[in-house]
Structures are given as structure tokens and as C-alpha cells.
């Protein structure tokens, strides 16, 4: 029988400076494109090699982005969230939620809807 998989959830403020090719990551999610069941939040789906986010090192694929420059990302359409990032300026402050998998007991498995999958 598999052990229970728990998650350690932490929040962090990440300040990025837009590089020559931008911020350097992709997002999924939004009210019209739920990435996680019953959650219309915005998640990081890809970190671009050598981009601003990768060079900073703190933002991870699977992180949930809670706000951009203090603006809440709740209840946004996907494209509205994309536009918010694109218009965020040179210095961009992200409030992010990291979700670290913590294994209890025998090895479990990651569910289909897990954003870190």
C-alpha cells in the first residue's frame, strides 16, 4: 500500500529584472483554462534556459503565481494573465507559492492533476 503524499506549501516574493528576451517563463491556468481541478490559478509551466527567471533560480516549474507587482491573479482569464506579465515593466515582483512534495512512508505516486507533473 502506498504511503500518503503530503505537500509543504511556502510563499516567496521574487523580484525579477526583465532580461533581453524578457522574463523567461511560460504560464498555464486561468478561469477559462484550469490547470488544476477546481483551481483557476496561474501556474509556471516552463522556465526558459538562460532567461531571467532561470538565472535568478528561485522560480520553479509548478509554482503558483499569486500576484504580479502587487496585483492579484485570482479570477483572471488566461490571456489577461499573459497580458499582465507582458505589460509588467522592467522590474517585476512576483508573489509565488511553492509546493514541495513530502513523502511519508512507502513511495506514493503523483496524481494527474498535480501542477508539478
Amino acid at each position: 500500500m502506498n504511503g500518503r503524499v503530503d505537500y509543504l506549501v511556502t510563499e516567496e516574493e521574487i523580484n525579477l529584472t526583465r532580461g533581453p528576451s524578457g522574463l523567461g517563463f511560460n504560464i498555464v491556468g486561468g478561469t477559462d483554462q484550469q490547470y488544476v481541478s477546481n483551481d483557476s490559478g496561474i501556474y509556471v509551466s516552463r522556465i526558459k534556459e538562460n532567461g531571467a527567471a532561470a538565472l535568478d533560480g528561485r522560480l520553479q516549474e509548478g509554482d503558483k503565481i499569486l500576484s504580479v507587482n502587487g496585483q492579484d491573479l485570482k479570477n483572471l482569464l488566461h490571456q489577461d494573465a499573459v497580458d499582465l506579465f507582458r505589460n509588467a515593466g522592467y522590474a517585476v515582483s512576483l508573489r509565488v507559492q511553492h509546493r514541495l512534495q513530502v513523502q511519508n512512508g512507502p513511495i506514493g505516486h503523483r496524481g494527474e492533476g498535480d501542477p508539478s507533473g
Epitope: 524578457g22 522574463l23 511560460n26 504560464i27 499573459v82 507582458r86
Partner: nanobody, 125 residues
Framework: DVQLVESGGGLVQAGGSLRLSCAAS????????MAWFRQGPGKEREFVAT????????YYADSVKGRFTISRDNAKNTVYLQMNSLKPEDTAVYYC???????????????????WGQGTQVTVS
């Protein structure tokens, strides 16, 4: 990850039409931003068109605007490039590209895409 296979290229006369297809294998195709790039003889690979996750967020290179149309069918895991009024300068190898999610930066740059097909040759005489 996603694998991409292009088809539909060929030889066509100036003023003619072709429709390119890019079939994707892998999960969650509807979450990928898809694009077409091309590389003409002796030239660098250049952006042609891109389409967002839900047949939205469509952008074209100025050189193809009004002549080319990008579209996608998420049920078939396929993206298309309808090319009309073809010109000799459209001669190139056309590549399909994909990236998971939506780039928060410009989707017009080659560096925005992680997955590439092998290309299909289009020759306009």
C-alpha cells in the same frame, strides 16, 4: 513532451496554395502554444505565425499577413498553416514548433519554443 511531424509541403506555382499540417503526439496538446517558422536557402530561421492554446492569440510575420492563416484543431492534436498567393520568396523549409503554456514574453522569437519538427519543404516556382 510533444513530438511534431509536419506534412503538406511540395512544389507549387507562384500564386498557388498549400496547406501544411503539424501532427503532435503527447499529452495536453491544448495547453501548448504552437508556431510555424521557416528557413529559406542561405537564410536564418524566421518566424511565420503563432497560435495560442484556444485558437486565440494569433500573430503573423508582416511578410505573410493577409496570405497565410494559422489554425489548430485540439481534438486532432494538429496545427495548420494555410498558405495562399504563394511567392517565390516563400520557398523554404517550414518547421512546426511548440512550447508548453503561454510565453509571458513575445511568442515571436525562436527561443520561445522548446520542441521542433523536422520540417517540410515548400518550393514556389
Amino acid at each position: 513532451d510533444v513530438q511534431l511531424v509536419e506534412s503538406g509541403g511540395g512544389l507549387v506555382q507562384a500564386g498557388g496554395s498549400l496547406r501544411l499540417s503539424c501532427a503532435a503526439s503527447g499529452r495536453s496538446f491544448d495547453r501548448y502554444t504552437m508556431a510555424w517558422f521557416r528557413q529559406g536557402p542561405g537564410k536564418e530561421r524566421e518566424f511565420v505565425a503563432t497560435v495560442g492554446w484556444n485558437d486565440n492569440s494569433i500573430y503573423y510575420a508582416d511578410s505573410v499577413k493577409g496570405r497565410f492563416t494559422i489554425s489548430r484543431d485540439n481534438a486532432k492534436n494538429t496545427v495548420y498553416l494555410q498558405m495562399n498567393s504563394l511567392k517565390p520568396e516563400d520557398t523554404a523549409v517550414y518547421y512546426c514548433a511548440a512550447t508548453f503554456g503561454s510565453p509571458v514574453d513575445t511568442p515571436l522569437d525562436r527561443g520561445a519554443y522548446d520542441f521542433w519538427g523536422q520540417g517540410t519543404q515548400v518550393t514556389v516556382s
